[in-house]
């Protein structure tokens, strides 16, 4: 970068090299060139010579002033016009950055995705800081009082093997950058309460010719959790509003869910599950599209994703559920 050049003097920024976006800043350049009394001192930002707001402070120093500086990053350098030199002489350069102090991290969430072997903690970092911001995740056992800290720049995966202090923990997040530091509220967790079942996946759909044609959606999960509650949402692709069916599910076999749908319409389906009575849901599964036939013939749709299932599938049973209307997004 610009900071690696050989300097014949120095360049500095007030109030600092990293500063709050929108501030007024001054960039100073001081020449120190053997037998060169600079006739002029020039400033360049990202290679372009600045023309205004330059003040000569003294024989070897000049100041460039910026009002309301809004660029997240800029490379600055300055040069001197030395007598009897046809080219400007490079004095020094510096990379400058502007941004914001971190917001207080909120919505701290820790979940264990089944089979992952990790506890994944995420949070809402707030507004973009534009500058390097680090997060320290504190995990404190409520049983042993032992505290562990994990440094990251976004979310964190903590191996469940490293959580040796029992089942109950406090988790909080500290955000820090050059402009400030903030700390989240503490989240109390129990490891047994934060497990999210293995992803539920829609594998296929078929519309069966009957007096009233019905569509059967086939879906499954690899979970070993016994009590699982699921939601399936669906809508015509032309609609805004989702319809939601709720199920209490036992994944010892492939699930079949029946829907009575309008003919000759393209529908989209998604499913998600949680351990019954627990807090966190899976994210909604991938979109599964199925177009109902105009008339009699049987239509089968296959999922876009092809998963390999470990269990041999022989018996299929029908599960039905309660139908609701849903405007919710994808928040667990």
């Amino acid at each position: 970068g610009i900071t690696n050049i050989n300097c014949s003097g120095h360049i500095w920024v007030e109030p600092a090299t990293i500063f709050k976006m929108g501030m007024n800043i001054s960039i100073y350049c001081q020449a120190a060139i053997k037998n060169c009394q600079p006739r002029k001192l020039h400033f360049y930002k990202n290679g372009i010579k600045e023309r205004f707001q330059i003040t000569r402070i003294n024989k070897t120093t000049a100041r460039l002033w910026y009002k309301n500086f809004l660029e997240p990053h800029a490379s600055m350098y300055c040069t001197a016009e030395c007598p009897k030199h046809f080219q400007e002489t490079l004095i020094c350069g510096k990379d400058i950055s502007s941004g914001y102090p971190p917001d207080i991290p909120d919505e701290v969430t820790c979940v264990i995705y089944e089979y992952s072997g990790n506890m994944t903690c995420t949070w809402n970092a707030g507004k973009l800081t534009y500058i390097d911001t680090k997060y320290v995740v504190h995990v404190k056992s409520l049983e042993t009082e032992e505290e562990q800290q994990y440094l990251t720049s976004s979310y964190i995966n903590i191996s469940t093997d490293s959580l040796q202090g029992g089942k109950k923990y406090l988790v909080w997040v500290q955000a820090a950058n050059a402009l400030g530091m903030e700390e989240s509220k503490q989240l109390q967790i129990h490891l047994d309460d934060i497990v999210i079942p293995s992803a539920a996946v829609i594998s296929r759909a078929e519309t069966i010719n009957a007096t009233v044609p019905k569509t059967i959606i086939y879906w499954d999960s690899q979970t070993t959790i016994e009590k699982v509650s699921c939601e399936m949402r669906y809508k015509a692709t032309t609609n805004q509003t989702w319809n939601v069916k709720e199920f209490d599910t036992n994944f010892t076999y492939v699930q079949q869910s029946e829907f009575y749908l309008e003919p000759n319409i393209k529908y989209v389906f998604q499913v998600r599950c949680q351990e019954t009575g627990k807090r966190y849901w899976q994210p909604w599964s991938s979109l599964f599209f199925h177009k109902t036939p105009e008339t009699v013939p049987q239509v089968t749709s296959k999922a876009f994703q092809h998963d390999t299932w470990n269990s041999g599938l022989t018996v299929a049973s029908i599960s039905t559920g309660h139908l609701t209307s849903d405007n919710r997004g994808d928040i667990g």
Epitope: Q30, A31, A32, I33, K34, N35, C36, Q37, P38, R39, K40, R56, I57, N58, K59, T60, T61, C82, P83, K84, H85
Partner: antibody
Framework: QVQLVQSGAEVKKPGASVKVSCKVS????????IHWVRQAPGKGLEWMGG????????LYAQNFQDRLTLTEDTSTETACMELNSLRSDDTAVYYC??????????WGQGTLVTVSS | DIQMTQSPSSVSASVGDRVTITCRAS??????LAWYQQKPGKAPKVLIY???SLQSGVPSRFSGSGSGTDFTLTISSLQPEDFATYYC?????????FGQGTKVEIK
């Protein structure tokens, strides 16, 4: 083009002080490094002191360290040389000169200072 | 301090002659050497800077050479207006110092 115009000739008694001015035009004082050089009658050139841009400081020759003061007034674009405790061997022509990449490209016209009782 | 020794201290020459003046520094001054011409009652005038660079406006009969400790000013063909005193000056380190001067006189 730099022009350096010095104040007029002075006659001083031994022990007195003299102040010679050097008015700059064409450039500002902040864009120039002003040095002072003197020449005793029939003798060579002697560097007295001046601004060193590499270290941003005013330097003085050892012989003059205790009694020479170099100042600048950017509001009037005037450099001054004050020499105290004058002796008869301080009789000389005093020049201000603008340093330009290791040489003096621009000189004042010179100021004759005569020290005599 | 760096001592600058010029030789000869004076030289008698005729118009059209080639004149060479040398200047020796008591220690290495790289190429930080200038040559001046001074006429009676006038301020010196720079001829050569950084040992060999000709100052703008100076006739090309003047040339400079050398580096380190030994330097030369050459006037290839002496003209009537060249009769004057010549000084070398080092600018490698402070205090800057001058040679004692070489007077070029009419033979």
């Amino acid at each position: 083009q730099v022009q350096l115009v010095q104040s007029g000739a002075e006659v001083k008694k031994p022990g007195a002080s003299v102040k010679v001015s050097c008015k700059v035009s064409g450039y500002t004082l902040n864009e120039l490094s002003i040095h002072w050089v003197r020449q005793a009658p029939g003798k060579g050139l002697e560097w007295m002191g001046g601004f060193d841009p590499e270290h941003s400081e005013t330097l003085y020759a050892q012989n003059f360290q205790d009694r020479l003061t170099l100042t600048e007034d950017t509001s009037t674009e005037t450099a001054c040389m004050e020499l105290n405790s004058l002796r008869s061997d301080d009789t000389a022509v005093y020049y201000c000169a603008a340093e330009s990449y290791g040489d003096y490209e621009f000189w004042g016209q010179g100021t004759l200072v005569t020290v005599s009782s | 301090d760096i001592q600058m020794t010029q030789s000869p201290s004076s030289v008698s020459a005729s118009v059209g002659d080639r004149v060479t003046i040398t200047c020796r520094a008591s220690q290495d001054i790289s190429s930080w050497l200038a040559w001046y011409q001074q006429k009676p009652g006038k301020a010196p005038k720079v001829l050569i800077y950084t040992a060999s660079s000709l100052q703008s406006g100076v006739p090309s009969r003047f040339s400079g050479s050398g580096s380190g400790t030994d330097f030369t000013l050459t006037i290839s063909s002496l003209q009537p207006e060249d009769f004057a005193t010549y000084y070398c000056q080092q600018a490698n380190s402070h205090p800057w110092t001058f040679g004692q001067g070489t007077k070029v006189e009419i033979k």
